[in-house]
């Protein structure tokens, strides 16, 4: 089952998946001036059996002005663009991709790739959160967002991160706790 | 179903203590921050601060700090607020609400009455 | 802390009519913005989050926009149901900040 919306946006925070389950699709855009191939496919999608999960589907872009299809390359690292769901300051890996069942890890890079990849995400995805750069963690607690289906209806859980600029902690007590891998889960709510 | 149920309506005098508390259900209580916010006779909304049920830690309003005390035990899912010396002025409605940017569901409301 | 302006502080409309409430923040707030109303003796409930994101349950005459420090609420034809006291709260800086409130009167 796809999640009907985006994770939520919080304050001075990005979200980052550290591993995609089975049913994710990437949709195949390609930056501007460049088209998915004829023949390319539309999106990505993670599919898998018990013991290994992988990312069916090839990503493939071509010029717009010509008819040539182009051939996949990994792009050198300062061609990598940023995009919404890797532009976290710091590595942050709460689970290691490999190792969790039912999941894809990121797909790597494609020749002439949007600037943005777009996820269309199913039921049980994670995604977790960290303050922007110039921000900090008020507090350790949960920093995730769960999709879950409650009441026929499916909806992210709302992330408990709460980051601040330096000048607005300083007039608050109490010791500034670092930002830690999400322990409790903010996600288990009562269904109907 | 998400529900915050708070305690009842208080009369009190200058200079007593009090406690009043906000029990929380239908959701996982100890990892979702609780909100409280006053609201006097015939007046508008004020946020006063916030607290997280798991570990009671607390952030307050400026206007607020050192007035009142937040505090949660997780293990009833139940977050209060307190205070040791009541003034006339702390006389408003106290909402219990849960965070932590906007608030998505409401307590009833306790009423606290401070009077000589 | 941030300061939320509401305005205006009262206003008188029949039902039918289409009511904009405006909030301006000191401060820019990106779309950090929640609506709420609330009805005399009762809890405020939440409308809008994220400047013009309408909460579940919420009627869609109920409108949210703006982003920075000015932001509209709309209710695009009044009920009978919304005669009540709407209130802005910006939670892009800590602490988070309520304006004082405007009163939606029967004319």
């Known amino acids: 089952e796809l999640c009907d919306d985006d994770p939520p946006e919080i304050p001075h925070a990005t979200f980052k998946a550290m591993a995609y389950k089975e049913g994710t699709m990437l949709n195949c855009e390609c930056k501007r001036g460049f088209r998915r191939i004829k023949s390319g496919s539309l999106y990505m999608l993670c599919t898998g059996n018990s013991s290994h999960s992988s990312w069916d589907n090839q990503c493939q872009c071509t010029s717009s002005a010509t008819r040539n299809t182009t051939k996949q390359v990994t792009p050198q690292p300062e061609e990598q663009k940023e995009r919404k769901t890797t532009e976290m300051q710091s590595p942050m890996q709460p689970v290691d991709q490999a190792s969790l069942p039912g999941h894809c890890r990121e797909p790597p890079p494609w020749e002439n790739e949007a600037t943005e990849r777009i996820y269309h995400f199913v039921v049980g995805q994670m995604v977790y959160y960290q303050c922007v750069q110039g921000y900090r963690a008020l507090h350790r607690g949960p920093a995730e967002s769960v999709c879950k289906m409650t009441h026929g209806k499916t909806r992210w859980t709302q992330p408990q991160l709460i980051c601040t600029g330096e000048m607005e902690t300083s007039q608050f007590p109490g010791e500034e706790k670092p930002q830690a891998s999400p322990e409790g889960r903010p996600e288990s709510e009562t269904s109907c | 179903e998400v529900q915050l149920v708070q305690s009842g309506a208080e009369v009190k005098k200058p200079g007593e203590s009090l406690k009043i508390s906000c029990k929380g259900s239908?959701?996982?209580?100890?990892?979702?921050?609780i909100v409280w916010v006053r609201q006097m006779p015939g007046k508008g909304l004020e946020w006063m601060g916030i607290?997280?049920?798991?570990?009671?830690?607390?952030r307050y309003s400026p206007s607020f700090q050192g007035q009142v005390t937040f505090s949660a035990d997780k293990s009833i899912s139940t977050a209060y607020l307190q205070w040791s010396s009541l003034k006339a002025s702390d006389t408003a409605m106290y909402y219990c609400?849960?965070?932590?940017?906007?608030?998505?569901?409401w307590g009833q409301g306790t009423l606290v009455t401070v009077s000589s | 802390d941030i300061q939320m302006t509401q305005s205006p502080s009262t206003l008188s409309a029949s039902v039918g009519d289409r009511v904009t409430i405006t909030c301006r923040a000191s401060?820019?707030?990106?779309?950090?913005l929640a609506w709420y109303q609330q009805k005399p003796g009762k809890a405020p409930k939440l409308l809008i989050y994220?400047?013009?994101s309408l909460e579940s349950g919420v009627p869609s005459r109920f409108s949210g926009s703006g982003s920075g420090t000015e932001f509209t609420l709309t209710i695009s034809s009044l009920q009978p149901d919304d005669f009540a006291t709407y209130y802005c709260?910006?939670?892009?800086?800590?602490?988070?900040?309520f304006g004082q409130g405007t009163k939606v009167e029967i004319k």
């Open positions: 609400t849960r965070g932590p940017y906007y608030s998505d569901y």
């Open positions: 239908g959701y996982n209580f100890a990892n979702y921050w």
């Open positions: 607290t997280y049920p798991d570990d009671s830690e607390t």
């Open positions: 401060q820019s707030i990106s779309s950090w």
């Open positions: 994220k400047a013009s």
């Open positions: 709260q910006q939670y892009d800086r800590f602490s988070w900040t």
